[in-house]
């Protein structure tokens, strides 16, 4: 029998400076593509090597991005969210939610729609 898998959720403000190749990460999500069950939020799907986000080190794959420069990302179409990032300027402030898996008891199973890891 599997043990219970709990999650520690924390929020953080991350300030990035756009580098020569941009911010250096990919996103998924939006009201038109629910990558997480019952959640149309925007998630980090890929951190690119040597990009601004990777060099900063705080943003992680699986993080949920709550806002960009103070603008809420709730209820946005995917492409609208992409455009928001692309037009965010040189200095970009991200409010992010980290979701860390905490294992209790025997190893649990994480579904494919879980952004952690």
């Amino acid at each position: 029998m599997n043990g219970r898998v709990d999650y520690l959720v924390t929020e953080e403000e991350i300030n990035l400076t756009r580098g020569p190749s941009g911010l250096g990460f990919n996103i998924v999500g939006g009201t038109d593509q629910q990558y997480v069950s019952n959640d149309s939020g925007i998630y980090v799907s890929r951190i690119k090597e040597n990009g601004a986000a990777a060099l900063d080190g705080r943003l992680q794959e699986g993080d949920k991005i709550l806002s960009v420069n103070g603008q809420d990302l709730k209820n946005l179409l995917h492409q609208d969210a992409v455009d928001l990032f692309r037009n965010a300027g040189y200095a970009v402030s991200l409010r992010v939610q980290h979701r860390l898996q905490v294992q209790n008891g025997p190893i649990g199973h994480r579904g494919e729609g879980d952004p952690s890891g």
């Epitope: 911010l23 990919n26 890929r46 794959e61 699986g62 992409v82 579904g111 952004p115």
Partner: nanobody, 132 residues
Amino acid sequence: EVQLVESGGGLVQAGGSLRLSCAASGRTFGMSTMGWFRQAPGKERELVSTISIIWRDGRTQSGGRTHYADSVKGRFTISRDDAKNTVYLQMDSLKPEDTALYYCAARFGSSVDVIIPDDYDYWGQGTQVTVS
């Protein structure tokens, strides 16, 4: 980390068929597109076909959009088995000019930066297809 392993390549006569497979393992969250590329000796790598991955309520679903290079339209068919996290390329009516090393690639979401079309995040090692 994500691993992509191709199989199914080989030597076939012109007019014959092959079915390539690409199995993805590791982290699949956020995978949005899988594609096949090829590179013939002395030529640039070129896109062969892509399939988008539909996510609904935290699960992948079949029926993603497909795209084909003009040179393979009507001869090649891309498909995906969601349960196996595997993408296939059925290649029929093969021609000598289809001879190349075939690579599988996966893209995870949309870049928040402007990107080039073949900016995929993970690549397989390739499988050789030779048409005589």
